[in-house]
């Protein structure tokens, strides 16, 4: 079986989610993603990065925040907040450029 | 074993806007190890990205389409969607979505014929 | 935006030669986000390489994918008939996903 490719050294991250497969995992980063679906309380997420690092620079909404971070279970004790209501014109999930 | 299907109009008038959703069955939609992503295919042509969602709602768009593309998921119903406003005979394509995860765009949908015609 | 130039646009070959695929991009992109497809008429791409030289599920060892910086290569060693169709490479994982115009691999 062909070896995965290398990233670099990973780091082990803190995970809480539905869909961990144990309480960390390995990742090029740590994340911690706060949503809030319509009608729903916000739901806090924990876990690894490796894809598409641009989300972790993008603004918090009312909807959505991203949080990442480098280094060994650095997002255990992270806490989020979202945004306060955005005005009607804005809308969820907007374009993080 | 992951599957990914387009469905929507095959058939669109110019200047209105183009609508297809992506339903994923096999798999859930909300893991965070994967992006949904459409991709485009002009008749005869190569691929054109035209962007990804998160299951968080989080968007990236392809900035030569950013300002009329609209991405959208429904975690409840495991799908996400792709709305292209302002059309013209030029979006005349075959409609894509696919599965990104560490290891590329593993999972494909058929794809779906849009024509853009009056 | 990263672009990522193809070349041959049209390789002609036989089967059992070996055929080789050009891709290079217009600045150095991480071998962990490059990738290879194959497209047939009618059908989907399908991933063949994945971190510029993993094997996908399933793909034979006859492809192999190697590179760094901005060139990168796809090898197939002995061609068989089913493996005439368009490559496609892939900068994916960013905000810049790109692909390539494509190169026709044809009977010769």
């Known amino acids: 079986d062909p070896v995965k490719p290398s990233r670099g050294p990973l780091v082990t991250c803190t995970c809480e989610s539905p869909h961990c497969r144990g309480p960390t995992c390995q990742g090029a980063w740590c994340t911690v993603v706060l949503v809030r679906e319509e009608g729903r309380h916000p739901q806090e997420h924990r876990g690894c990065g490796n894809l598409h690092r641009e989300l972790c620079r993008g603004r918090p909404t009312e909807f959505v925040n991203h949080y990442c971070c480098d280094s060994h279970l650095c997002n255990r004790n992270v806490s989020l907040v979202l945004e306060a209501t955005q005005t009607p014109s804005e809308q969820p999930g907007t374009d993080s450029q | 074993q992951v599957q990914l299907q387009e469905s929507g109009p095959g058939l669109v008038k110019p200047s209105q806007t183009l609508s297809l959703t992506c339903t994923v069955s096999?798999?859930?939609?909300?893991?965070?190890?994967?992006?949904w992503n459409w991709i485009r295919q002009h008749p005869g042509k190569g691929l054109e990205w035209i962007g990804y969602i998160y299951y968080s709602g989080s968007t990236y768009y392809n900035p030569s389409l950013k300002s009329r593309v609209t991405i959208s998921v429904a975690t409840s119903k495991n799908q996400f969607s792709l709305k292209l406003s302002s059309v013209t005979a030029a979006d005349t394509a075959v409609y894509y979505c696919?599965?990104?995860?560490?290891?590329?765009?593993?999972?494909w949908g058929q794809g779906t014929l849009v024509t853009v015609s009056s | 935006e990263i672009v990522l130039t193809q070349s041959p646009g049209t390789l002609s070959l036989s089967p059992g030669e070996r055929a080789t695929l050009s891709c290079r991009a217009s600045?150095?992109?991480?071998?962990?986000?490059l990738a290879w497809y194959q497209q047939k008429p009618g059908q989907a791409p399908r991933l063949l390489i994945y971190?510029?030289?993993s094997r996908a599920t399933g793909i034979p060892d006859r492809f192999s994918g190697s590179g760094s910086g901005t060139d990168f290569t796809l090898t197939i060693s002995r061609l068989e008939p089913e493996d005439f169709a368009l490559y496609y490479c892939?900068?994916?994982?960013?905000?810049?996903?790109?692909f390539g115009q494509g190169t026709r691999l044809e009977i010769k």
């Open positions: 600045q150095s992109v991480s071998t962990t986000y």
């Open positions: 971190g510029a030289s």
């Open positions: 096999g798999g859930s939609i909300s893991s965070g190890d994967y992006y």
């Open positions: 696919a599965r990104e995860a560490t290891e590329g765009f593993d999972y």
């Open positions: 892939q900068h994916y994982g960013t905000s810049s996903i790109t």
